[in-house]
Amino acid sequence: QLPPGKPEIFKCRSPNKETFTCWWRPGTDGGLPTNYSLTYHREGETLMHECPDYITGGPNSCHFGKQYTSMWRTYIMMVNATNQMGSSFSDELYVDVTYIVQPDPPLELAVEVKQPEDRKPYLWIKWSPPTLIDLKTGWFTLLYEIRLKPEKAAEWEIHFAGQQTEFKILSLHPGQKYLVQVRCKPDHGYWSAWSPATFIQIPSDFTMND
């Protein structure tokens, strides 16, 4: 029977800068029941606070609701593991909520084959930003990535769309059914999951780009 091993806070994520959750990995339990607590303070403060919500994020997590979440202030947090034989502390983790946003996937993905008379045909892809993200304030810049592939193909073709919410693709295989998905990330933050796939049938008379 031993004191617990050192835990590690390994991930923090926010869907929208208004709330966030951090998760830790326990160390070894030393063969005894072990209790974990997360404490934190904000930069410039000395007053320590305990995690406000150990439930919402699941096991080994701490959730910070709206009233506990401040943008532009660094949180300094650590996890304490305690059993009958002693305690151990994680390294301190410095967290700025602005930098840990992982948005929901983009919405309203629409895909259409365009065949203008005077130009090459192309695939036109359009989407909307996720609803929880407020782009109007200027706090967020969202970047987008598209992936597509013929239905039976193994490899995805990836296109970086920057900040735009529509994109044209010229080189496609005529007669194939394509899957198209889009994802987004803040300029500092994490990629969302891919949106649900949209299927599009490319006409047999679609002319490949030279």
Epitope: K11, E43, D96, Y99, K185, H188, Y190, W191
Partner: antibody, heavy 120, light 107 residues
Framework: EVQLVQSGAEVKKPGSSVKVSCKAS????????MHWVRQAPGQGLEWMGE????????NYNQKFKDRVTITADKSTSTAYMELSSLRSEDTAVYYC?????????????WGQGTLVTVSS | EIVMTQSPATLSVSPGERATLSCKAS??????VAWYQQKPGQAPRLLIY???NRYTGIPARFSGSGSGTEFTLTISSLQSEDFAVYYC?????????FGGGTKVEIK
Amino acid sequence: EVQLVQSGAEVKKPGSSVKVSCKASGYTFTTYWMHWVRQAPGQGLEWMGEIDPSDSYSNYNQKFKDRVTITADKSTSTAYMELSSLRSEDTAVYYCARNGGLGPAWFSYWGQGTLVTVSS
Amino acid sequence: EIVMTQSPATLSVSPGERATLSCKASQYVGTAVAWYQQKPGQAPRLLIYSASNRYTGIPARFSGSGSGTEFTLTISSLQSEDFAVYYCQQYSSYPWTFGGGTKVEIK
């Protein structure tokens, strides 16, 4: 204990490439951005670029954009910096540096440095 | 890019005295400034982040101040181990940039 251990010194010819490695231990590699900073002999520090090892998303100093490639191998917790088309003024100590937290780019842990000498 | 200008280039101070190092940014950077200490043959060591926050384990004699474009690192009472080169760094906008350094030497 957090450690960043870099590969050994290199001597390279002008026009060639160099690839410096930085093996991380003591923390979860994918949690923090990794940066590369260089220091020419007797000179100051110059940021070259950064990578998020969780998805290999990277940003570069435009000064090096066409010559530098930063990669990360999650399976070995190792970051790499490759600099191509070397010239004599690339002679420097190259450091990897871990982001201080989940936040802006200040650097709390540094590798020991790798001296790259470019000479004909 | 944002240019960080440090002054003086060299500062001669006696042990036990106060040292005041200056760093000026060519554009507004808010409080997105860090300070590092570097000794010969060693990697830099983080002292201060967000202009005024001491990093974990850094002695209280090191303090940072300033916002906007003008920043100061103060070492209240220099110890023998504090003689080194000090760099400021901005992380307000890409590319992240460092000042040219201030060498603090024994008077």
